[in-house]
Interface confidence: low
């Protein structure tokens, strides 16, 4: 198992063998056997289960052994353990990240990272890509950070800074992990938001015209949702006129926070004959189906 | 990766019940269809229905209707399709599909056998 | 339910020939359909989408055509692998369903 810190910061690892809270823990250096003192005057001591590091230095890292001592069966588990110096700048690199947390919610909350192995104190502070949070959306409570009203703009590193209290010393700590939104999904009967329903749209003889029908489906991708357009009821394919065509593909959008579709229905020669047809733009997918008729006027 | 990953073949008595999954993994799970297709031993394709994990909105084809259960754990990423008490000719292989505009993605299928 | 009618059953074709096949509604469907491939003991591969959309990685041989009712899947020039099941599916209405499929086989 591996740990890290930063340097002059607190580290508190736990012995990555479990047993009874009852069983002693004996802690050593791996490489030189070297048994681990309980006393707090050491910058590195034991405490149960738990090897303090107070403050942690960078020449601190290599491998520790710590052995859990049962009536019956001695465990051992072993822990690599690397100190850092701190970064210069604010991008903090990979290896100093806890695991990213996914949101789907509008509000959310973020966990500190391995605050619980800490005697820390209220409030802990919040910092997003370094800067200090203080916006009323966010909310430190406890461990946590929430964020009301979620968006994709929250997105980035989220860095906790709190005090370790230990013999009337304080030590800072700090743990940094990422944060992305990812989209909830949702599916609905289909929405027409282009052209309104019966819609009158002004064109000119003989000069080409574009009717495009859009239409949102929910958020997220949605199995088999279509536009499409027919022409007194028949499909424009089979309605016999080679200056009506509907253009070929699904052109996606998105608009207020829906997944959107949209096809374009184009006629290359505008004709008397065309003002007395009906233009239907369906959209459809597995809730149904919804029409909206459109009529063309001479300009 | 997209990946579907379906359970492992059944073999299973009249009236006994039983529940196969289909894992999504490599994609937001919440944001696709997963549909459910039979397939009877040299016969062709059918769709039993359909679910929406983001909102768990179902539907079902009528032949299937009362006949099976479809349910989606999104903490898992996982999709069921289960029976309460299964008959001789429900023995086939059961496809799940993630199909979403242009792409689409399908289980390996499970093999459910159904005798006495 | 809609009704798709795919014929014909069977087509034994050689590699390199062309291969049409078809598929009819019993009512309109507008351009709301799909083509799928399956090979033994395979899961289905979806070829076409929207009646003549090539899904992604779809090779250009493979064509659909068609709007209403009557529906083609063409392919161009029969590679070895192409030797399958060919199913269309109508997404125009609830339920979804299948034709009961093209064997297309070696002659």
């Known amino acids: 198992k591996s740990s890290w810190g930063l340097e002059n910061e607190a580290l508190i690892v736990r012995c990555p063998q479990r047993g009874r809270s009852t069983y002693p823990v004996e802690w050593y250096y791996s490489d030189t056997n070297e048994s681990i003192p309980t006393q707090k005057r050491n910058r590195i001591f034991v405490s149960r289960d738990r090897l303090k590091f107070l403050p942690a230095r960078v020449e601190d890292s290599g491998i520790y052994a710590c052995v859990i001592r049962s009536p019956n069966l001695n465990k051992t588990g072993y822990l690599n353990v690397t100190i850092h110096k701190k970064p210069p700048s604010c991008n903090i690199p990979d290896y100093l990240m806890y695991s990213t947390v996914r949101g789907s919610d509008k509000n959310f909350k973020i966990t500190c990272p391995t605050i619980d192995l800490y005697n820390w104190t209220a409030p802990v502070q919040w910092f997003k890509n370094c800067k200090a949070l203080q916006e009323p959306r966010f909310r430190a409570h406890r461990s946590y950070l929430f964020i009301d009203n979620v968006t994709h703009d929250d997105e980035g590193d989220y860095t906790c800074q709190f005090t370790h209290a230990e013999n009337g010393t304080n030590y800072i700590v700090t743990a940094t992990r990422s944060f992305t939104v990812e989209e909830k999904g949702f599916s609905m009967f289909p929405v027409i938001t282009n052209p309104p329903y019966n819609h009158t749209m002004e064109v000119e003889i003989g000069k080409p015209a574009s009717i495009a029908c859009s239409a949102c489906f929910g958020k997220g991708s949605h199995f088999l949702a279509d536009v499409l357009w027919q022409i007194n009821k028949t499909v424009v394919g089979n309605f016999g006129e080679a200056r009506i065509q509907e253009e070929e593909g699904r052109n996606e959008s998105s608009s207020n926070d829906m997944d959107c579709l949209t096809s374009v229905l184009r006629i290359t020669g505008v004709t008397e004959k065309d003002l007395s047809l009906e233009y239907d733009c369906l959209a459809l997918n597995l809730h149904g189906m919804i029409r909206h008729t459109i009529r063309l006027r001479r300009k | 990766e997209v990946q579907l990953v379906q359970s492992g073949a059944e073999v299973k008595k009249p009236g006994e019940s039983l529940k196969i999954s289909c894992k999504g993994s490599g994609y937001s799970f919440t944001s696709y269809w997963i549909g459910w297709v039979r397939q009877m031993p040299g016969k062709g394709l059918e769709w039993m229905g359909i679910i929406y994990p983001g909102d768990s909105y179902t539907r079902y084809s009528p032949s299937f209707q009362g006949q099976v259960t479809i349910s989606a754990d999104k903490s898992i990423s996982t999709a069921y399709l289960q029976w309460s008490s299964l008959k001789a000719s429900d023995t086939a292989m059961y496809y799940c599909?993630?199909?979403?505009?242009?792409?689409?993605?399908w289980g390996q299928g499970t093999l459910v056998t159904v005798s006495s | 339910e809609i009704v798709l009618t795919q014929s014909p059953a069977t087509l034994s074709l050689s590699p390199g020939e062309r291969a049409t096949l078809s598929c009819r509604a019993s009512?309109?469907?507008?351009?709301?359909l799909a083509w799928y491939q399956q090979k033994p003991g395979q899961a289905p591969r979806l070829l076409i989408y929207?009646?003549?959309n090539r899904a992604t990685g779809i090779p250009a041989r493979f064509s659909g055509s068609g709007s209403g009712t009557d529906f083609t899947l063409t392919i161009s020039s029969l590679e070895p692998e192409d030797f399958a099941v060919y199913y269309c599916?109508?997404?125009?209405?609830?339920?979804?369903?299948f034709g009961q499929g093209t064997k297309v086989e070696i002659k």
């Open positions: 929207k009646a003549s």
């Open positions: 009512q309109s469907v507008a351009n709301a």
């Open positions: 599916q109508q997404y125009y209405g609830w339920p979804i369903t």
């Open positions: 599909a993630r199909i979403g505009g242009m792409f689409d993605y």
